[in-house]
């Protein structure tokens, strides 16, 4: 890892990568792009998956937070031999399948998809790709697209969440390195701190949640602060204000001293959550303190 910017967000990150015949001589650039980007997501709660597509979609590495498995997954990725058609929808389908299975029982982790392709998608293939990207969105995913060389930006804007979720790389594959910082900045949603981190038992408080990327939601009205109390009950609260680097939220009233509330954020009205290691604890406050 080369230091520099990093992301501390706890969510599920899916790389959906074009391995069709047209990238045959550029796979190394794609691999190094993914490898460098993957190393920037450093939360122990972040899980990652590598999916490739050509004439069909293949999950090279299922979701894992295990860094050794991720290292092995990157090795598998490096060995990929491109060839075949650009069936991008097959890649999205493999991601949706994982989002569905991994989150079906109760708590849903937020999902971020970064899809990379180099070509224009012809009629049916574009229709299928948009349909499957929508299905991933239905399951709570935020979708980003990286277009290299001969891509159609209008198409990618419809497959991604919006035009702002598309990263055009017009100067060919060697220019992929140049967008790592901007992708990291845009795709990273992280909770870094809460102020105050200790609140008085039985009293109402407002909490400032410090972090990044809170305005990356498709609709900021759907952002929620979530408090998981003593690892059991979860309370969701609508923030008073949503800025990119902080949220101002009402904290739940925690009646007893020593109660702990783990802080989470939802970007989609509670469909899924970004986790963190930020904890708010209660203490006894005497009158006048």
């Amino acid at each position: 890892e080369d230091g520099g910017p990093a992301c501390y967000g706890g969510f599920d990150l899916y790389f959906i990568l074009d391995k069709s015949g047209s990238v045959l001589h550029h796979w190394n650039e794609i691999y190094y792009f993914v490898e460098q980007l993957a190393h920037k997501f450093i939360s122990p709660q972040l899980r990652m998956s590598f999916i490739v597509f050509s004439t069909r979609g293949t999950t090279l590495m299922k979701l894992t937070e295990d860094r050794e498995q991720i290292r092995q997954g990157l090795e598998e990725l490096q060995k990929v031999l491109p060839g075949g058609d650009t069936y991008m929808h097959e890649g999205f389908e493999r991601a949706s399948e994982q989002i569905y299975y991994e989150n079906r029982q109760g708590y849903r982790t937020a999902s971020v998809i970064i899809a990379l392709t180099d070509g224009e998608l012809h009629e049916d293939l574009f229709f299928y790709s948009e349909r499957e990207a929508n299905r991933s969105r239905d399951l709570g995913a935020i979708v980003y697209c990286v277009g290299v060389k001969d891509f159609n930006e209008t198409q990618l804007a419809r497959i991604a969440d919006s035009k702002d979720h598309v990263f055009p790389v017009n100067d060919g594959f060697q220019a992929l390195q140049g967008i790592i910082h901007s992708i990291l900045k845009k795709s990273c949603i992280e909770i870094l701190a809460a102020e105050p981190s200790t609140i008085c038992a039985g009293e109402s408080f407002q909490v400032v949640v410090r972090g990044n990327g809170f305005r990356h939601a498709r609709n900021v009205d759907r952002v929620l602060c979530s408090f998981k109390i003593n690892d059991s009950v979860t309370l969701n609260e609508k923030p008073f204000s949503v800025e990119d680097t902080y949220l101002l939220c009402p904290a739940p009233i925690l009646k007893e001293v020593g109660m702990k509330a783990a802080l989470q954020v939802s970007m989609n009205d509670g469909l899924s959550f970004i986790s963190s290691s930020v904890i708010i604890t209660t203490t006894h406050c005497s009158d006048g303190s």
Epitope: R104, D138, L139
Partner: antibody, heavy 121, light 106 residues
């Protein structure tokens, strides 16, 4: 709880059309998170998926390659049911046919009771 | 598409552990599901997404998936577990089933 109730004839003549219906109670055919499918089971071919429909602001379908040219699955929102039509049947199509709910579109978590359809003259 | 192969039959003594395999080329990159079917009844989902158990399915049912083999494990097998078991996976707009394994509880 959710239940699927199948109906349709048990005997169909060769070259005719097999038609079955699956009525849903406790869920909606146009629910956004699910698909609805048909599977058949025969001693010779085991379990075989035939196709699915699902609603995501409009209706979509996917069919198995083996029957793609002969199959139609349609929703009926007014009756909260969906149907299977399989054209130009042959004795090879003799099987127990099941309808099923497919949450997320990826697996079969609830099945109808099954209908034995025999193709014979 | 992926082809799933199961042993035709597996026998186990009551209280023992039964393991049913489902092999397919690189099946670990797919998700395996398992269905139980008793005579004259529709199949019932017992494991999905490799290792997850639907509500209402006893804890003795578990699943795993690595390499070229997915495995359904029934620990402390009971007489009522005697049934046919089918593995299944979803690949490229197609749902593939194994040929089924008859589990006999001796």
């Amino acid at each position: 709880q959710v239940q699927l109730q199948q109906s349709g004839p048990g005997l169909v003549k060769p070259s005719q059309t097999l038609s079955l219906t699956c009525a849903i109670s406790g869920d909606s055919v146009s629910t956004n998170g699910a698909a609805w499918g048909w599977i058949r089971q025969s001693p010779g071919r085991g379990l075989e998926w035939l196709g699915r429909i699902y609603y995501r602001s409009k209706w979509y379908n996917d069919y198995a390659v083996s029957v793609k040219s002969r199959i139609t699955i349609n929703p009926d929102t007014s009756k909260n049911q969906f149907s299977l039509q399989l054209n130009s049947v042959t004795p090879e199509d003799t099987a127990v046919y099941y309808c099923a709910r497919m949450p997320g579109g990826f697996l079969f978590d609830l099945w109808g009771q099954g209908t034995l359809v025999t193709v014979s003259s | 598409d992926i082809e799933l192969t199961q042993p035709p039959s597996v026998s186990v003594a009551p209280g023992q552990t039964a393991r049913i395999s489902c092999s397919g080329d690189n099946i670990r990159s797919y998700y395996a599901h398992w269905y139980q079917q008793k005579p004259g009844q529709a199949p019932v989902l017992v494991i999905y997404g490799d290792s997850k158990r639907p509500s209402g399915i006893p804890e003795r049912f578990s699943g795993s998936n690595s390499g070229n083999t997915a495995t359904l494990t029934i620990s402390g097998t009971q007489a009522e577990d005697e049934a046919d078991y089918y593995c299944s996976s979803y690949a490229s707009h197609d749902y593939v089933f194994g040929g089924g394994t008859k589990l006999t509880v001796l």
